[in-house]
């Protein structure tokens, strides 16, 4: 075994935002309304949920989820099209469960390739691999029916899952994924 | 009860190869991730290695790199370091500690001792 | 050198409050958990906060943990003598890929 057996390290440290200003931190603005939102989180490389105040800010801000992830994430678009155009299942789809060494406890899911079913297990929070998702609904589409959805669901192949938890990122930072006991 | 014992300490001379083991009884260890942790002397804790419960992830210390390698064996219910290449700065006090999510088993800890 | 620092040492007299920070960045403490433990050398190391600011079964509500940005603190109410040890935090550092440990801090009671 190598010192990470999955090599994550390759599948993503390399990861870099399309544009600068993907890097921004979320910011709300001076004013008061509370719109939802969506950024870039360059540390967990998704695109997440905020509330907006309605004015200054940056341009780190996007309307709806999915044109956020066509701004800020390599690849998206290519990757969406591919899903759902019955393409291949992705290989990381097929690599064995892999819960990290850390002592986080996050629910997720998994595609079990003797099943070929999605399945919940715990993630510990670091390191793992990317057969690794958030919700059952987004290892359906990536790993179980790549070729029957929209594509539009496909959260951040690219895998976040790198954190113990987020519950440190930008302020009113309201993502719905991280805060399962 | 849960208990934790370390051996495979000793003094040994530099450039030498140790295999420090960790058995553990009161608790299956499968599912769970393990660790070691150091304190060389008057300095403070290291961790130094870190392994997942099927062994798939696998973390070090910058530090160690190249001359410790960690492994487990759940049938034995035993974790293992073996250091190669043993340098004076490895003379410390080892630990080996299970971080489960909201609570923590330790060994003890068991000497090495590095000198010519 | 570890990358998160805490004071080398804090004292206090018996009934204090004393507070140990661990200051880090955002690979480790700004989107990680961080813990906190009690060690006596030679002894094995005491968990006494888990993720932040949760305390573990047997540890007394004396000992609190908080975090805020890049930084944890831990809190030790109504010190006591018992209480004199080395505190340590620790964190998953996502840039290392490694855990680290703070560079500990010396508490002492006084008097």
């Known amino acids: 075994l190598s010192e990470e057996a999955d090599d994550t390290d390759s599948e993503l440290g390399s990861m870099k935002p399309l544009h600068t200003f993907c890097a921004m931190k979320a910011d709300d603005g001076p004013c008061k309304a509370m719109i939802r939102s969506y950024f870039f989180n360059m540390y967990t490389h998704q695109c997440e949920e905020f509330i907006y105040g309605g004015c200054e800010g940056n341009e780190n801000r996007f309307d709806t989820l999915e044109e956020c992830k066509k701004t800020c994430i390599p690849g998206y678009e290519k990757t969406a099209v591919k899903a759902a155009s019955g393409a291949e299942r992705p290989d990381f789809c097929f690599l064995e469960e892999d819960p990290g060494l850390c002592r986080g406890y996050m629910k997720r899911y998994l595609y079990n390739n003797q099943t070929k079913q999605c399945e919940r297990f715990v993630y510990g929070g670091c390191l793992g691999n990317r057969n690794n998702f958030e919700t059952l609904d987004e290892c359906k589409k990536i790993c179980e029916n790549p070729g029957g959805g929209s594509g539009g669901g496909l959260n951040d192949i690219f895998e976040a899952q790198k954190i113990e938890w987020h519950e440190g990122g930008p302020p009113h930072h309201h993502h719905h994924h991280h805060h399962h006991h | 009860e849960v208990q934790l014992v370390e051996s495979g300490g000793g003094s040994v001379q530099p450039g030498r190869s140790l295999r420090l083991s960790c058995a553990v009884s009161g608790l299956t260890i499968d599912n769970y991730a393990m660790q070691w942790v150091r304190q060389r002397p008057g300095k403070g804790l290291e961790w130094v290695s870190g392994?997942?419960?099927?062994?798939?992830?696998?973390g070090y210390a910058d530090s160690v790199k190249g001359r410790l390698t960690i492994s487990r064996d759940n049938a034995k219910n035993s974790l293992y370091l073996q250091i190669d290449s043993l340098r004076a700065d490895d003379t410390a006090l080892y630990y080996c500690a299970i971080f489960l999510h909201e609570s923590d088993y330790w060994g003890q800890g068991t000497l090495v001792t590095v000198s010519s | 050198q570890s990358v998160l620092t805490q004071p080398p040492s804090v004292s206090g007299t018996p009934g204090q409050r004393v507070t140990i920070s661990c200051s880090g960045s955002t690979s480790n403490i700004g989107t990680m958990y961080v813990h906190w433990y009690q060690h006596v050398p030679g002894t094995a190391p005491k968990l006494l906060i888990y993720r932040n600011n949760h305390r573990p079964s047997g540890v007394p509500d004396r000992f609190s943990g908080s975090k805020s940005g890049t930084s944890g603190s831990l809190a030790i109410s109504g010190l006591r003598s018992e209480d004199e040890a080395d505190y340590y935090c620790?964190?998953?550092?996502?840039?290392?890929?490694?855990?680290?440990f703070g560079t500990g801090t010396k508490v002492t009671v006084l008097g």
């Open positions: 392994i997942s419960g099927n062994s798939r992830s696998i």
């Open positions: 620790l964190a998953w550092d996502d840039t290392l890929r490694a855990y680290v």
